[in-house]
Amino acid sequence: VPPGEDSKDVAAPHRQPLTSSERIDKQIRYILDGISALRKETCNKSNMCESSKEALAENNLNLPKMAEKDGCFQSGFNEETCLVKIITGLLEFEVYLEYLQNRFESSEEQARAVQMSTKVLIQFLQKKAKNLDAITTPDPTTNASLLTKLQAQNQWLQDMTTHLILRSFKEFLQSSLRALRQM
């Protein structure tokens, strides 16, 4: 996880410690680098990255996705709605990141780093959103049953699920990064 200590969200703190905005930006880019490494292993190991059968696996998943109504795109941008969506989405991704933990051989540490860095990112964003409405967290029981269901899939579906999680998480973070730069 990139270094950084607490500092103010509003106004301009000194160079050390890192500002809230810089920590968030660096953290997202760090996670995106980790996802790239994991995607490399996934694509080398199977042909999932070229598969046209993604829809079969996507039916079993409810991965967070940015939509117009979330206010994170240039068209219809709404910073408060968007920030809530980013945090909510990251919280929803946590169960899928937990699923990824046993899915990698050579990149096991990288998968753990992505998971832990995401937790840190959520904390950074929650500080930035401290004046916004309460953010709903996913139900642990629902997450536990989803995890069990995903782990019970056959090998092909598990490989496809891994590929889809990484692709969706990358897209979600890229959209988040663009939006957060305005905030």
Epitope: E22, Q74, S75, F77, N78, K128, M183
Partner: antibody, heavy 119, light 106 residues
């Protein structure tokens, strides 16, 4: 044509106040963060402040914190810089600038308005 | 705040010359930008995020570098390129600028 037009500059005494305006046209104002950057006569550029598109977050340079306030009126596509307790060293051309969507670059700048603080 | 040092402070060059301006930071920066400013005018964005050419900027301008050392290159200087060039960085607030490099006609 995409443009920003600053106004409100002028001569003011030390300790006085001034409000600068930045009117945007030719683009949808609402998704963009805005910044003010100033340039003292014959000197380089100095970033002053930023405001997020909805005004929820503001950032200021140490030199103006507590004296300047950045605000928006999105219905008028206008940004404002309220400058209080002005000092001689605040004398500069003040530019407002739009932040490129999805990046930190300041891509569109106004022509600037001159603020002179002198007795 | 991150201090940026541009070199040279000024240079004289002829039309067609290849011109290189450098910008050094005391510590690593996240994003670097380059601007052109002509007398009495607002700065104009040339390069963003180290090496991306801004919309409408001629391809003779290019940016490179990472970490603490960055370069703006004008491959073949044109008459309209005589101006002052500034580097600017973002690594959290505040944004900071270099002191400028004035490109004059030899």
């Amino acid at each position: 044509e995409v443009q920003l037009v600053e106004s409100g500059g002028g001569l003011v005494q030390p300790g006085g106040s001034l409000r600068l305006s930045c009117a945007a046209s030719g683009f949808t104002f609402s998704p963009f963060a805005m910044s003010w950057v100033r340039q003292a006569p014959g000197k380089g550029l100095e970033w002053v402040a930023k405001i997020s598109p909805g005004g929820s977050w503001t950032y200021y340079s140490d030199t103006v914190t507590g004296r300047f306030t950045f605000s928006l009126d999105t219905s008028k596509s206008t940004a404002y810089l309220q400058m209080n307790s002005l000092r001689a060293e605040d004398t500069a051309v003040y530019y407002c600038a739009r932040q490129l969507w999805g990046y930190y670059a300041l891509d569109i700048w106004g022509q600037g308005t001159l603020v002179t603080v002198s007795s | 705040d991150i201090q940026l040092t541009q070199s040279p402070s000024s240079l004289s060059a002829s039309v067609g010359d290849r011109v290189t301006i450098t910008c050094s930071a005391k510590i690593s920066v996240s994003y670097m930008y380059w601007y052109q400013q002509k007398p009495g005018k607002a700065p104009k964005l040339l390069i963003y995020d180290m090496s991306n050419l801004a919309s409408g900027v001629p391809s003779r301008f290019s940016g490179s570098g990472s970490g603490t050392d960055f370069t703006l290159t004008i491959s073949s200087l044109q008459p309209e390129d005589f101006a002052t060039y500034y580097c600017m960085q973002w690594s959290g607030y505040p944004y900071t600028f270099g002191q400028g490099t004035k490109v004059e006609i030899k």
